[in-house]
């Protein structure tokens, strides 16, 4: 069996779909094009995945190896506090907003960044190798 993350257990370990990267127990999709946060979320959901929810500092550090200076949307939003799309609070890293419109979270090789959700950015989707498993 795949070793589960904090939020899910992937029941088996097949390979990931084309253009997805297998890392640990999950498949990751790093986009080539750019979209706003909502469109990025829709893209991931349509592929039985979700905008990247990072479970801990270790996962964040490992993923940052694949990132550049360019920011990518992740499943992080400020709704009365920074929370991941699975509802869990951001508690292993820090992000701060410089203006009231910066309510979505992005990541690059240097860390997390608050941004206006309207900015077109690359994005990262995450899913278990089987589409019928938990999203996170």
């Amino acid at each position: 069996l795949c070793q589960g993350s904090n939020y899910s257990t992937c029941a088996s370990c097949p390979s990931c779909p084309d253009r997805w990267m297998k890392y640990g127990n999950h498949c990751y999709y790093f986009s080539v094009e750019e979209k706003d946060w909502n469109s990025s979320l829709e893209f991931c959901l349509a592929r039985d995945s979700h905008l990247l929810v990072i479970t801990d500092n270790q996962e964040m550090s490992l993923l940052q190896v694949f990132l550049s200076e360019a920011f990518c949307w992740i499943g992080l939003r400020n709704n009365s506090g920074w929370r991941w799309e699975d509802g869990s609070p951001l508690n292993f890293s820090r992000i701060s907003s410089n203006s009231f419109v910066q309510t979505c979270g992005a990541i690059n090789k240097n860390g997390l960044q608050a941004s206006s959700c309207e900015v077109p950015l690359h994005w990262v989707c995450k899913k278990c190798p089987f589409a019928d498993q938990a999203l996170f």
Epitope: F71, S97, N98, S99, F100, V101, Q102, A106, Q113, A114, S115, S116, E118, V119, P120
Partner: antibody
């Protein structure tokens, strides 16, 4: 190089209307919030209005709310300020300004300004 | 609305002097403060954001500090081109309020 060029200023009578334009170049206009800031002769800076990337959200200073409308045409890389019911106190140099990116709403780049004079 | 108050309103100094301009917010704005320089007949120039982060291309003799309600802009050694009017600005929320300006003149 980021360039913002304002136009449309001039002399207008109280109660009149005017539309200012700001032509943007040297950056991807459709990625940035844009704003108007004004400066009355011999006075300080006053924020007037800000518009989101898509144009779906607009924000105004109380002094111009209901009289001024900020808009943008991303296909034309142009920002607008429609001013109506103009008053003597609206006399100022009007600057177009671009934010710092990602919704960082400081005014990182400024145009050279266009003078609006409201007088009978 | 948050009010921004600068002091002094004007200041005379000489080339080589160390100069400090103060900006006070009417309530806690954390670090959401920008500074601008404006010369007569010109558009303002962006200097600093988040109270202390220098904009690209701004000389290192400029520095910003403070958080909460009290902020300062310091020029460590005045150069002839630094004589201008300086404005602080709250950049987190609406309205984006400016201070009234500090005019830095040659003594």
């Amino acid at each position: 190089e980021v360039q913002l060029v304002e136009s449309g200023g001039g002399l207008v009578k109280p109660g009149g209307s005017l539309r200012l334009s700001c032509a943007a170049s040297g950056f991807t206009f459709s990625r940035y919030y844009m704003s108007w800031v004004r400066q009355a002769p011999g006075k300080g800076l006053e924020w007037v209005a800000t518009i989101s990337i898509s144009g779906g959200s607009t924000y105004y200073a109380d002094s111009v709310k209901g009289r001024f409308t900020i808009s943008r045409d991303n296909a034309k890389n142009t920002l607008y300020l429609q001013m109506s019911s103009l008053r003597a106190e609206d006399t100022a140099v009007y600057y177009c300004a671009r934010e710092g990116g990602y919704g960082n709403l400081w005014f990182a780049y400024w145009g050279q300004g266009t003078l609006v004079t409201v007088s009978s | 609305d948050i009010q921004m108050t600068q002091s002094p309103s004007s200041l005379s100094a000489s080339v080589g002097d160390r100069v400090t301009i103060t900006c006070r917010a009417s309530e806690n704005i954390y670090s959401a403060l920008a500074w601008y320089q404006q010369k007569p007949g010109k558009a303002p120039k962006f200097l600093i954001h988040n109270a202390k982060t220098l904009a690209e291309g701004v000389p290192s003799r400029f520095s910003g500090s403070g958080s909460g309600t009290d902020f300062t802009l310091t020029i460590s050694s005045l150069q002839p081109e630094d004589f201008a009017t300086y404005y602080c600005q709250y950049h987190y929320g609406i309205p984006f309020t400016f201070g009234q300006g500090t005019k830095l003149e040659i003594k």
